[in-house]
């Protein structure tokens, strides 16, 4: 799965920044806007009475540059540098008239078929659970196996370093082929199969990856927003997993929601399955001590734990994964389209 080159993006922020650097006015405005904030977080209107005139003017001068509307890609090289530029420029779009954050990631739909070889699975017992089978599929793939071992190593042991573990998790879900990553994490289990459920819940090594004491969810979001990558992943998730109705219709495609969900794993906002017996997911945080922001905190928490779009997307992907092993495929090697599960 080659990393997308900048040229494959319609308007990469890295390209746009280079173009801006060649223009003294644009370059100076970009630097000035960058100095208008010491952290990545955009204050909410309630926190700041107004934006200083110089920042507004610098933003105004950037509004007709190619930087406005530039985007990044989740698998591109120099992704963090691209996201840094995106969020600096985002201030130019939102200063003065606060706008909700927009995902920095350009949608690129791939129709490249991923080949999976099921023939080697016959070494497993026929009644092995599907999580075991998907784990084996990963093991049989050199890249998936290498990446999984890397995070397994980083996330194991009594003295694991959480930040190293998270970095390796992030790398896995970024670089492993999507069907492998999704198969590993979103494998279906029989309702009474606690062993399978336990295996699924432990996929992301929660003992190391998740905080030992659940922090406040709003504090967790604040921490996330101070990092351009985490902020980007969270905004991407909120963009694509936004439920349109209680039936689980997503704002965009279910597959896009799942990609965004998996993109959070390895960030400060790493979600996980809450138990061995169902497919409910949640953030590892609490809304205790939120004071007058209790409602806002519960909305954030609920975006994970009570989100019909996400719930239905996970359920649909698990149904799809079940079908892979229940059908009589004509050949041991079959192709799974990456966009198979879009609605």
């Amino acid at each position: 799965d080659p990393l997308p080159t900048e040229s494959r993006l319609m308007n990469s922020c890295l390209q746009a920044r280079r173009k801006c650097q060649a223009d003294p006015t644009c370059s100076a405005a970009y630097h000035h806007l960058d100095s208008c904030t010491s952290s990545i977080s955009t204050p909410l209107p309630s926190e700041e009475p107004s934006v200083p005139a110089d920042c507004l003017e610098a933003a105004q001068q950037l509004r007709n540059s190619s930087l406005i509307g530039c985007m990044c890609h989740r698998r591109m090289k120099n992704q963090v540098a691209c996201l840094d530029i995106y969020w600096t420029v985002h201030r130019a779009r939102s200063l003065g008239n606060y706008e909700l954050d927009v995902s920095p990631y350009e949608d690129t739909v791939t129709s490249k078929p991923w080949k999976m070889n099921l023939s080697k699975l016959n070494m497993l017992k026929p009644d092995s659970d599907l999580c075991l089978k998907f784990a084996m599929l990963c093991t049989l793939n050199d890249k998936c196996d290498r990446l999984r071992k890397a995070y397994g190593e980083a996330c194991s042991g009594p003295h694991c370093q959480r930040h190293v573990c998270l970095r390796q998790l992030l790398t896995f879900f970024e670089k492993a082929a999507e069907p492998h990553a999704q198969g590993l994490l979103l494998c279906p289990c029989a309702p009474n199969d606690r062993g399978c459920g336990e295996r699924r819940r432990n996929t992301i090594a929660p003992n190391c990856a998740l905080p030992p004491v659940a922090p406040n969810c709003l504090e967790l979001r604040r921490l996330c927003f101070s990092d351009p990558l985490c902020r980007s992943r969270l905004v991407d998730f909120q963009t694509h997993c936004h439920p349109m109705d209680i039936l689980g219709t997503c704002a965009t495609e279910q597959s896009r929601c799942l990609r965004a969900y998996l993109g959070l794993i390895g960030t400060a906002m790493t979600p996980n399955f809450v138990s061995n017996v169902n497919t409910s997911v949640a953030l590892s945080c609490t809304c205790r001590g939120s004071g007058n922001l209790q409602e806002e905190c519960e909305m954030l928490e609920g975006f994970f734990s009570h989100n019909p779009c996400l719930t239905e997307a996970i359920a649909a992907k698990m149904r799809f994964h079940s079908q892979l092993f229940s059908q009589d495929w004509p050949h041991p090697t079959f192709a799974v389209m990456a966009h198979q599960n879009e609605n």
Partner: antibody
Framework: EVQLLESGGGLVQSGGSLRLSCAAS????????MSWVRQAPGKGLEWVSF????????YYADSVKGRFTISRDNSKNTLYLQMNSLRVEDTAVFYC?????????????WGQGTLVTVSS | DIVMTQSPDSLAVSLGERATINCKSS????????????LTWYQQKPGQPPKLLIY???TRESGVPDRFSGSGSGTDFTLTISSLQAEDVAVYYC?????????FGLGTKVEIK
């Protein structure tokens, strides 16, 4: 060395017009915002108008809005202030001032000023 | 508009003594996102244009003697001349540049006692 030299001031009757100029040298004129600031005799400083380096953004004090127009000619390194419908209370020394950046912050260089006197 | 209030109106200080000028803004000029105070101080001697002394509330302009210092945050600011010299006789103005229009205080006249 940065230099700003105002000209165009003088005595004018109420309701009349004047055009002030400010010749700039010693810096990349088109990269910096410029402002006009005035000072009535024996009084404090009052900001009048702002223009960005490209001329794309202009702002005015409420007291002069609709009567004064700020402009610049970057090829001539010159800042202008066209003043129409002048009033007695516009009597002041008018300074052109260079912005430290290009965004309307503080003024790091000032001209010597040109006196505008509006008589009734 | 942000109103800038300077005190005192005038100040007589002996040579070598400390002079302190206060400036208060009607609303905060501290921008929490970059932790900068949008306040500057100018010195104006008779018959001359203003000269920049201090910006961002406490950063001294190059070439300005280190006896001049600025302090304060939010709405309350101070310009201090640690040891007054004869050439410091002038009117001192504070200015906010947080919002348009930028506004000046009415000035504080510093004289020698």
């Amino acid at each position: 060395e940065v230099q700003l030299l105002e000209s165009g001031g003088g005595l004018v009757q109420s309701g009349g017009s004047l055009r002030l100029s400010c010749a700039a040298s010693g810096f990349s004129f088109n990269n910096y915002a410029m402002s006009w600031v005035r000072q009535a005799p024996g009084k404090g400083l009052e900001w009048v108008s702002f223009i960005s380096g490209s001329g794309g953004s202009t702002y005015y004090a409420d007291s002069v809005k609709g009567r004064f127009t700020i402009s610049r000619d970057n090829s001539k390194n010159t800042l202008y202030l066209q003043m129409n419908s002048l009033r007695v209370e516009d009597t002041a020394v008018f300074y052109c001032a260079k912005d430290r950046y290009n965004y309307g912050t503080f003024f790091d260089y000032w001209g010597q000023g040109t006196l505008v006197t509006v008589s009734s | 508009d942000i109103v800038m209030t300077q005190s005192p109106d005038s100040l007589a200080v002996s040579l070598g003594e400390r002079a302190t000028i206060n400036c208060k803004s009607s609303q905060s000029v501290l921008y929490s996102s970059n932790n900068k105070n949008y306040l500057t101080w100018y010195q104006q001697k008779p018959g001359q244009p203003p000269k920049l002394l201090i910006y961002w509330a406490s950063t001294r302009e190059s070439g300005v003697p280190d006896r001049f210092s600025g302090s304060g945050s939010g709405t309350d600011f101070t310009l201090t001349i640690s040891s007054l010299q004869a050439e410091d006789v002038a009117v001192y103005y504070c200015q906010q540049y947080y919002s348009t229009p930028p506004t000046f205080g009415l000035g504080t006249k510093v004289e020698i006692k």
